[in-house]
């Protein structure tokens, strides 16, 4: 039930915490974790619904 | 769909250990933080604590040494222990999911309302 | 920990009616990493809370576009358009981005007038 990582910086962190593409980073401890750890959104195929518009999937968010 | 589903005793007596669990079905509780927060009477919500990914825990500092969260990967489950209970313990306890994209409590229990009296 | 002060307590209202709930947090919720984490929920009698705006500005999924959520560095408001109905319950707000402890406002009860 993994929502795998994403790559695509959005508009609305200007400053985002750098990390690699495959990695998230976590408020809670302050740094870049595995995204498969966090609790992040899936890509779904065209046409699902989504649990949230993330029109901004950024994993430095 | 993740769901979520708080058991325990509804009536605890004063200076008593609540123990609450949280089953959890849609997602693994190997992933992500999982939390525990309830609501008092008159609509207060206190952030009680989680447990992490990696077993990890974060107790809110006005519980003291008195509550534990822990876990169960092989039931998929997570559990509270509040000891030496008292009437101002008397609430609705949820556990919840959180986002870890935006950080927002996406997934909450139904609640389970949990009273402290002798 | 951060105190997140919301008001009013209490706001009654007219089914078609605006209705406009503040939120003050002690700290600017503007994270280093440049996003504000503040978010709102309601929670419907009986129910448990449910997200309603997340990251001050953004509508969960489902919610009408009847909600909306404006503010920056303490200040914030949610309105509703126009009230239903269904509508009716607490309003909290929160804050993600001084954690941990989360914390969440005192709740603004909507009720009818």
């Known amino acids: 039930m993994r929502r795998g990582p994403r790559s695509l910086r959005g508009r609305d962190a200007p400053a985002p915490t750098p990390c690699v593409p495959a990695e998230c980073f976590d408020l809670l401890v302050r740094h870049c974790v595995a995204c498969a750890l966090l609790r992040t959104p899936r890509p779904k195929p065209a046409g699902a619904s989504s649990p949230a518009p993330r029109t901004a999937l950024q994993p430095q968010e | 769909d993740v769901q979520l589903q708080e058991s325990g005793p509804s009536l605890v007596k004063p200076s008593q250990t609540l123990s609450l669990t949280c089953s959890v079905t849609?997602?693994?509780?190997?992933?992500?933080?999982w939390n525990w927060i309830r609501k008092f009477p008159g609509n207060k919500l206190e952030y009680m604590g989680y447990?992490?990914?990696?077993?990890?825990?974060y107790y809110n500092p006005s519980l003291k040494s008195r509550i534990s969260i822990t876990r169960d990967t092989s039931k998929n489950q997570f559990y509270l222990q509040l000891l030496s209970v008292t009437t101002e313990d008397t609430a609705t306890y949820y556990c919840?999911?959180?986002?870890?994209?935006?950080?927002?409590?996406?997934?909450w229990g139904a609640g389970t309302l949990v009273t402290v009296s002798s | 920990d951060i105190v997140m002060t919301q008001t009013p307590l209490s706001l009654p209202v007219s089914l078609g009616d605006q209705a406009s709930i503040s939120c003050r947090s002690s700290?600017?919720?503007?994270?280093?990493?440049?996003?504000?984490?503040l978010h709102w929920y309601l929670q419907k009698p009986g129910q448990s809370p449910k997200l309603l705006i997340y990251?001050?500005?953004n509508r969960f999924s489902g919610v009408p576009d009847r909600f909306s959520g404006s503010g920056s560095g303490t200040d914030f408001t949610l309105k509703i358009s126009r009230v239903e109905a269904e509508d009716l319950g607490v309003y909290f707000c929160?804050?993600?981005?001084?954690?941990?402890?989360?914390?969440f406002g005192s709740g603004t009860k909507l009720e009818i007038k």
């Open positions: 919840a999911g959180l986002d870890g994209l935006y950080w927002y409590f996406d997934v």
């Open positions: 990251k001050v500005s």
């Open positions: 700290q600017s919720l503007v994270h280093s990493n440049g996003n504000t984490y």
């Open positions: 447990i992490s990914y990696s077993g990890s825990t």
């Open positions: 929160s804050q993600s981005t001084h954690v941990p402890p989360f914390t």
């Open positions: 849609g997602d693994s509780i190997t992933s992500g933080y």
